[in-house]
C-alpha cells in the first residue's frame, strides 16, 4: 500500500447477464490499470420488492468517488439501480445501502446476499 492506502488488486466478479455476455457468472477478477491510476471494486444491484438482485460486480476505474472507501456503500436516496465502489481487495464482497437524507435519521441496510452469489 502507498501512504497507507489499500491497493485494489482483485475484486469479486459477478455478471447477471453471463449467458448473454458469454462470461462466467461469478469469480475473481484481477484489476489492471496504468501505474498512476488507482483501482477500485464496485457492485451494482436492484431491490425488487425487497429482494436483492445483483447486476454486476467487478473492478472499477480510477474514480475520485471511490477514494479511501473501505466499504462498498450506496448513499443515493432510492435509486433505480444501486451502485457502490470501494478500495481494497475483494471489498465489493459485501455492500450496503445507507442513504444520505436531509431530514430523517439515516438507516443502515447491509446487504449480504446468500449463495449462489458467494460460493
Amino acid at each position: 500500500a502507498i501512504l497507507g492506502r489499500s491497493e485494489t488488486q482483485e475484486c469479486l466478479f459477478f455478471n447477471a447477464n453471463w449467458e448473454k455476455d458469454r462470461t462466467n457468472q461469478t469469480g475473481v477478477e484481477p484489476c489492471y490499470g496504468d501505474k498512476d491510476k488507482r483501482r477500485h471494486c464496485f457492485a451494482t444491484w436492484k431491490n425488487i420488492s425487497g429482494s436483492i438482485e445483483i447486476v454486476k460486480q467487478g473492478c472499477w476505474l480510477d474514480d475520485i468517488n471511490c477514494y479511501d472507501r473501505t466499504d462498498c456503500v450506496e448513499k443515493k436516496d432510492s435509486p433505480e439501480v444501486y451502485f457502490c465502489c470501494c478500495e481494497g481487495n475483494m471489498c465489493n464482497e459485501k455492500f450496503s445501502y445507507f442513504p444520505e437524507m436531509e431530514v430523517t435519521q439515516p438507516t443502515s441496510n447491509p446487504v449480504t446476499p446468500k449463495p449462489p452469489y458467494y460460493n
Epitope: 447477464n17 455476455d21 489492471y32 464496485f42 468517488n65
Partner: antibody, heavy 120, light 107 residues
Framework: EVQLLESGGGLVQPGGSLRLSCAAS????????MNWVRQAPGKGLEWVAG????????SYADSVKGRFTISRDNSKNTLYLQMNSLRAEDTAVYYC?????????????WGQGTLVTVSS | DIQMTQSPSSLSASVGDRVTITCRAS??????LNWYQQKPGKAPKLLIY???SRASGVPSRFSGSGSGTDFTLTISSLQPEDFATYYC?????????FGGGTKVEIK
Amino acid sequence: EVQLLESGGGLVQPGGSLRLSCAASGFTFSSYSMNWVRQAPGKGLEWVAGINYNGGYTSYADSVKGRFTISRDNSKNTLYLQMNSLRAEDTAVYYCARGANWHDTALDYWGQGTLVTVSS
Amino acid sequence: DIQMTQSPSSLSASVGDRVTITCRASQSIVSYLNWYQQKPGKAPKLLIYAVTSRASGVPSRFSGSGSGTDFTLTISSLQPEDFATYYCQQSYDSPLTFGGGTKVEIK
C-alpha cells in the same frame, strides 16, 4: 507511450472477407480488454466487438454477430477482427480501442483507424 | 439495447462561452457513462469516464455530471481547440452504445 496501429483495411466485394489487425505497444497488452468500434462515412460511432484481457470473454453487436470474430494474441501484442460475409453497410473506418476491465469499458486509447470499403 | 440520446445534435458557440451537452439513456445506467471528443479525420479521444472523472491530460474546463438516465457534459469556457463532435457512451450493458453526437461549431 500507448500506441495502437490498425491495418488490413481495403476494398472488398459484398460477401467477401477481411482480417483487421491492431498492433499495440507502450502498455501491458495482456492486462487490458480491447474493442473494435466503427464509424461509417459521415455517421456516428458504433461499437462492434470486445474481448477481455485473456481472450476468455467476447461480446458482439447484433449487427455483426455470426459474421465477425474478435480475437487476440497476447504473445504478439495484437488484436484481430475477422470479418466474413461483408455487406455494404459494413463500410466504415474501423478503430481498435483499449478498455480496462470487463464491466467498466471506458475506451481510453484509440488507434487512427483503417478504412474498410465494401462495394462491387 | 440501451439507447443513448444526445441533445442538441449541433450547436454554435463563441470562444469563452459556457457549453452544455446532454445525454439521456433509455434506462438507468448508474455511473457507466463516458464522454468522447472527436475532431474531423481523427480518432475519438476519451474526455470523461464514470460520469465525472476526467481522463489523463483533459483540461479542468471539461466536467461531467448526472446519474441514472440523465447526464451532462459542460465546457465552462469554450476554447478554439474545443470545436469538435462530442459523443456519450454507456458501458452498463452489452452492447456498448453511443449517443448520436453533438457537433460544436464556431458561431
